[in-house]
Interface confidence: low
C-alpha cells in the first residue's frame, strides 16, 4: 500500500525548492526499480516529485490566501514491466499560514455622529478590521483594537472595536474629532502586523448654552409722535448653540409703565422693541426697561443650563416733537 504522512507547505517560502515530504509504496525496497509520477493541477509547475524516491518538493512560492489546498494524484510504476505497482491515489497538500497579512478596515471611511455632553460609556460606532490570514492558525488573524489618537475623549473595546465615549465633550469648543484606531493581529505578540483607520466623530448640538445678551445696556430713541406698534429698535443675544437650540424668545422682564413690548424675529433671532402705548415727551421723556431672553426649546434634562435667563437694560429716550 501507499505510505505517506499529511503534507503541509508553509506559504511564502523563499527556498527555491522546499521539501514537503515523501510518497512511497511499501513494496519499494529501494533498488530504484520503481518510478513515481505526480498528476493533477500544479504537478510539474508548482510541485515536483523525485521519480526514484517519491520525495515531493514545492518549487514555487505559495500564497495561502490565494489557494490553501492542492489535490494531486500519485502513481507508482514498476520500471521493468511498466505496470502500476499500486492503484492511483489522491492526496492533499495543505498550504500552512504565516502571518503575512495586516488587518484591514474594509468599511472606511468611518463617520459617526454623537450628541455633545453624552455620558461616559455611550456607544459611538463599531469599527471592524478583517485579516486575510487563517483564523484557525494560531493568532495570525486574532485582532486587538487600540486607540492611537482620541484620548481622553474616546476608548475602544480591545476585542470588539466598539468605540465609546470616555469623557464628556462640548461641541461649542470642538465640533468634531478624528479618532485613530489600530488593529493588531497576533493578539499584540511579537511579529504582529497592524492596520489603522481614522474615524471622524461629529458632535451634534444639544441645548447646553443659554442665550446671552451681547450688550448689558441698549440705548434707543422714540419720537413722541410714533404710533403704537412702531418698532423702535432691536436688541440681540448670542447663543453658542446652533439650529433650533439657538432659537430664542425675547420678553419684557420689567416695564413699570407698560409702554413697551418685545417681539422676536425668528429669522434673525433679534428682539424688536415695540411701542405698546403712545409716549408724551412732556409727561415722561425717558424710560428704563429690562428685557430677558430664553431659548425656545429646552428639554427638561437640560434645564440646569438655563436656570437664570440673561437680561439687559434698555434706556429709551423720548424725542420731543413740536406740537401746535
Amino acid at each position: 500500500g501507499w505510505v505517506w504522512n499529511q503534507f503541509f507547505v508553509p506559504e511564502e517560502m523563499n527556498t527555491t525548492s522546499h521539501h514537503i515530504g515523501q510518497l512511497r509504496s511499501d513494496l519499494d525496497n529501494g533498488n530504484n526499480s520503481f518510478q513515481y509520477k505526480l498528476l493533477g493541477a500544479g504537478a510539474g509547475s508548482t510541485f515536483i516529485i523525485d521519480e526514484r524516491t517519491g520525495d515531493i518538493y514545492a518549487i514555487q512560492k505559495l500564497d495561502r490566501e490565494e489557494r490553501s489546498l492542492y489535490i494531486l494524484r500519485a502513481q507508482v510504476i514498476d520500471i521493468a514491466t511498466g505496470r502500476a505497482v499500486e492503484p492511483e491515489s489522491e492526496f492533499v497538500i495543505k498550504v500552512s499560514d504565516i502571518n503575512d497579512n495586516e488587518p484591514k478596515f474594509l468599511d472606511e471611511p468611518y463617520e459617526a455622529i454623537v450628541p455633545e455632553m453624552s455620558p461616559e460609556g455611550t456607544l459611538v460606532i463599531q469599527v471592524t478590521a478583517s485579516d486575510a490570514d487563517d483564523p484557525s492558525s494560531g493568532n495570525n488573524a486574532r485582532l486587538l483594537y487600540s486607540l492611537l489618537q482620541g484620548q481622553p475623549y474616546f476608548s475602544v473595546e480591545p476585542t470588539t472595536g466598539v468605540i465609546r465615549i470616555s469623557s464628556k465633550m462640548d461641541r461649542e469648543l470642538q465640533d468634531e474629532y478624528w479618532v485613530i484606531i489600530q488593529a493588531k493581529d497576533m493578539i499584540g505578540q511579537p511579529g504582529a502586523l497592524s492596520g489603522t483607520t481614522s474615524v471622524l466623530i461629529k458632535l451634534s448640538d444639544v441645548n447646553d448654552n443659554k442665550p446671552i445678551f451681547k450688550e448689558s445696556l441698549y440705548r434707543l430713541t422714540v419720537s413722541e409722535s410714533a404710533p403704537t406698534g412702531t418698532s423702535i429698535g432691536t436688541i440681540m443675544a448670542y447663543d453658542n448653540d446652533i439650529g433650533e437650540n439657538a432659537e430664542m424668545d425675547y420678553s419684557i422682564e420689567e416695564d413699570d409703565s407698560q409702554t413697551f413690548d418685545i417681539i422676536t424675529n425668528h429669522e434673525t433671532q433679534e428682539g424688536i422693541v415695540i411701542l405698546k402705548k403712545k409716549v408724551d415727551f412732556e409727561h415722561q421723556n425717558h424710560y428704563g426697561i429690562r428685557a430677558k431672553v430664553k431659548n425656545h426649546h429646552v428639554p427638561e434634562q437640560l434645564m440646569k443650563y438655563h436656570t437664570e435667563a440673561s437680561t439687559t437694560f434698555i434706556k429709551i429716550q423720548v424725542e420731543d416733537v413740536d406740537e401746535p
Epitope: 469648543l173 470642538q174 465640533d175 468634531e176 478624528w178 450688550e215 453658542n240
Partner: antibody, heavy 120, light 110 residues
C-alpha cells in the same frame, strides 16, 4: 486634531509681493473663518484680516487695506495671504489662525508660522 | 499703540498668583468676548482662555479669566516656571469691524 500647515520661509526685496499658504486638515474647512496674524521681531501680535473660505468673504484691517489679498481654495482646503509693496517693516512671522463659525469667535488653532524677511 | 492696553511685564515667584489686566472700550471688551493667548518663546500662540472665562481642554485650572465692563483680566495661580511666556488678550471690535490684540505682557517667573 485640527492641523494648519503653512508654507516655508521667504526672503523678498522691498516693493515685491509675497504669498503665504496655509493648508487645513481634519475639520470641515468651509465652516470656519480663517484669520492672518503677524508678529514682527520682538513685537506683539497684529491682526491683518479674515476670510470665510466657503464664500470667500474677506475683512481686512485698515492698515493693510489695498496691500493684502486673502483667498481660499476649497478643493485643497488651503487659504492664501498675499502682501504686496513690501517694505522692511513687513519683516515678521505670519500666522494663519482658525477662527470660529462666527466672525467674532476666538482663534482656536494656529499654524506654525512663516517667516517673511524683507531686505534689499 | 494698541487698542487694548496690557502691562508690558509682570512677574511672580513659583506658587504665587499673578494677574494680567487688559483694558479696552465699549466697542470691543464692552461688546464682545475676551480671549487670552499664551505664546511660549519661539512658538505659535496657543488659545488659553476663550469667551471671557472658558478653558480649552488641556489648559490647567490654574488659569482663569474674567471680564467686567470694558476691562478683562487673566489670573494665574500656583505660578510655575513653565508659565514664563507672553500673554495677549484679543477681542473683536465692533467699531473697527476687526480683531484687536493687546500689546502683550511678558510674564517672568522669578
Amino acid at each position: 486634531q485640527v492641523q494648519l500647515v503653512q508654507s516655508g520661509a521667504e526672503v523678498k526685496k522691498p516693493g515685491a509681493s509675497v504669498k503665504v499658504s496655509c493648508k487645513a486638515s481634519r475639520y470641515t474647512f468651509t465652516s470656519y473663518y480663517m484669520s492672518w496674524v503677524r508678529q514682527a521681531p520682538g513685537q506683539g501680535l497684529e491682526w491683518m484680516g479674515i476670510i470665510h473660505p466657503s464664500g470667500g468673504d474677506t475683512t481686512y484691517a485698515q492698515k493693510f487695506q489695498g496691500r493684502v489679498t486673502m483667498t481660499g481654495d476649497t478643493s485643497t482646503s488651503t487659504v492664501y495671504m498675499e502682501l504686496s509693496s513690501l517694505r522692511s517693516e513687513d519683516t515678521a512671522v505670519y500666522y494663519c489662525a482658525r477662527g470660529g463659525i462666527k466672525l467674532w469667535l476666538h482663534f482656536d488653532y494656529w499654524g506654525q508660522g512663516t517667516l517673511v524677511t524683507v531686505s534689499s | 499703540q494698541s487698542v487694548l492696553t496690557q502691562p508690558p511685564s509682570a512677574s511672580g515667584t513659583p506658587g504665587q498668583r499673578v494677574t494680567i489686566s487688559c483694558s479696552g472700550s465699549r466697542s470691543n471688551i464692552g461688546s464682545n468676548f475676551v480671549n487670552w493667548y499664551q505664546q511660549l518663546p519661539g512658538t505659535a500662540p496657543k488659545l488659553l482662555i476663550y469667551t471671557n472665562n472658558q478653558r480649552p481642554s488641556g489648559v490647567p485650572d490654574r488659569f482663569s479669566g474674567s471680564k467686567s465692563g470694558t476691562s478683562a483680566s487673566l489670573a494665574i495661580s500656583g505660578l510655575q516656571s513653565e508659565d514664563e511666556a507672553d500673554y495677549y488678550c484679543a477681542v473683536y471690535d465692533e467699531s473697527l469691524q476687526g480683531w484687536v490684540f493687546g500689546g502683550g505682557t511678558k510674564l517672568t517667573v522669578l
